[in-house]
């Protein structure tokens, strides 16, 4: 029985040219995480973190994607094309598969600075 839940950073915005951390957290289960897959909005695979064999990054993103922190993923040098959905898929034993969704909006620098000024601390 799958008792766990995935918590994500939800809907986030970041500045064009900047960086952002995509983070999912699996809680309420003792299941062992065997692999985490990070997919982009078009369902292309960005990165894999295998429990035994470590991180693997899609070659086209090697310069812009950094593993971590933890099981998360850091996207750097953001472009407007990075806007969209991102999915974390947690493969676990014995529970099975958990999936989380994050929506990233990349904003033009001036817009991002403006919206940041009005965020509640």
């Amino acid at each position: 029985m799958m008792t766990g839940t995935i918590e994500t950073t939800g809907n986030i915005s970041a500045k064009k040219g900047g960086s952002v951390i995509l983070q999912c957290h699996l809680s309420s289960t003792m299941a062992q995480v065997t692999q985490v897959n990070w997919e982009q909005h078009d369902h292309s695979l960005l990165a894999i973190r295998n429990a035994e064999l470590g991180w693997h990054i899609y070659p086209a993103f090697k310069d812009r994607v950094a593993p971590g922190p933890g099981l998360g993923l850091t996207l750097q040098s953001l472009t407007m094309n990075d806007t969209g959905e991102y999915f974390c898929t947690y493969h676990t034993y014995p529970d099975g598969t958990y999936r989380g969704r994050i929506f990233l909006e990349v904003l033009e620098s001036s817009v991002a600075e403006h919206s940041a000024r009005f965020q509640i601390p």
């Epitope: 065997t34 692999q35 897959n37 695979l45 693997h56 899609y58 070659p59 493969h91």
Partner: antibody, heavy 117, light 106 residues
Framework: EVQLVQSGAEVKKPGASVKVSCKAS????????IYWLRQAPGQRLEIIGR????????YFVDKFKNRATLTTDTSASTAYMELSSLRSEDTAVYFC??????????WGQGTLVTVSS | DIQLTQSPSFLSASVGDRVTITCKGS??????LVWYQQKPGKAPKLLIY???NLQSGVPSRFSGSGSGTEYTLTISSLQPEDFATYFC????????FGQGTKVEIK
């Protein structure tokens, strides 16, 4: 042209160690991880472990954690796999392979290691 | 980890035949499936990646398809150089291989 050339066949006694080499050419050696895999007679391929030539970091499948050692000589663009405490079940063809993202795009020709008393 | 089962394990065929090999996963492979060709004493050769993408330099008679747990490799017209062993590999959950399918001359 990317090439991985492995050392020749070995015959070892139980309890001994074997060291297999894999010389890479045709690409920048430090830009891709090297995997080591093996195929025992009549069995499917299984992964032993991985080494990142850029920093020497190694990763192992649990089964091989205590017996396998992976190293590289970046100046010679060569990777090495040493397996200790050999037993008859280690008789297999051992492969090195380059990983490109998530799959192996170039492989060595394989090295047959026979463990026999 | 996902277990991959290929069928058939052995296949006898003639030059010009259309050949289909199946690879079935114990769980959803999510299209993260690769096909290799291997000849005795030679390095395995990458044929198809991500289910249906032909690797550069591989003849167009090779094609791949599938989704979920079931995938196929098709050789539209078998050539003399195609007699070999073919195996699948997945990376959706763990990195695992099928047991191989040996294509022999009938």
């Amino acid at each position: 042209e990317v090439q991985l050339v492995q050392s020749g066949a070995e015959v070892k006694k139980p309890g001994a160690s074997v060291k297999v080499s894999c010389k890479a050419s045709g690409y920048t050696f430090t830009e891709h991880s090297i995997y080591w895999l093996r195929q025992a007679p009549g069995q499917r391929l299984e992964i032993i472990g991985r080494i990142d030539p850029k920093n020497g970091r190694t990763y192992f499948v649990d089964k091989f954690k205590n017996r396998a050692t992976l190293t590289t000589d970046t100046s010679a663009s060569t990777a090495y796999m040493e397996l200790s405490s050999l037993r008859s079940e280690d008789t297999a063809v051992y492969f090195c392979a380059r990983i490109d993202g998530f799959y192996f795009d170039f492989w060595g020709q394989g090295t047959l290691v026979t463990v026999s008393s | 980890d996902i277990q991959l089962t290929q069928s058939p394990s052995f296949l006898s065929a003639s030059v010009g035949d259309r050949v289909t090999i199946t690879c079935k996963g114990s769980q959803n492979v999510n299209k993260y499936l690769v096909w290799y060709q291997q000849k005795p004493g030679k390095a395995p050769k990458l044929l198809i990646y991500s289910t249906d993408n032909l690797q550069s330099g591989v003849p167009s008679r090779f094609s791949g398809s599938g989704s979920g747990t079931e995938y196929t490799l098709t050789i539209s017209s078998l050539q003399p150089e195609d007699f070999a062993t073919y195996f699948c590999y997945q990376y959706n959950n763990g990195f695992t291989f099928g047991q191989g399918t040996k294509v022999e001359i009938k």
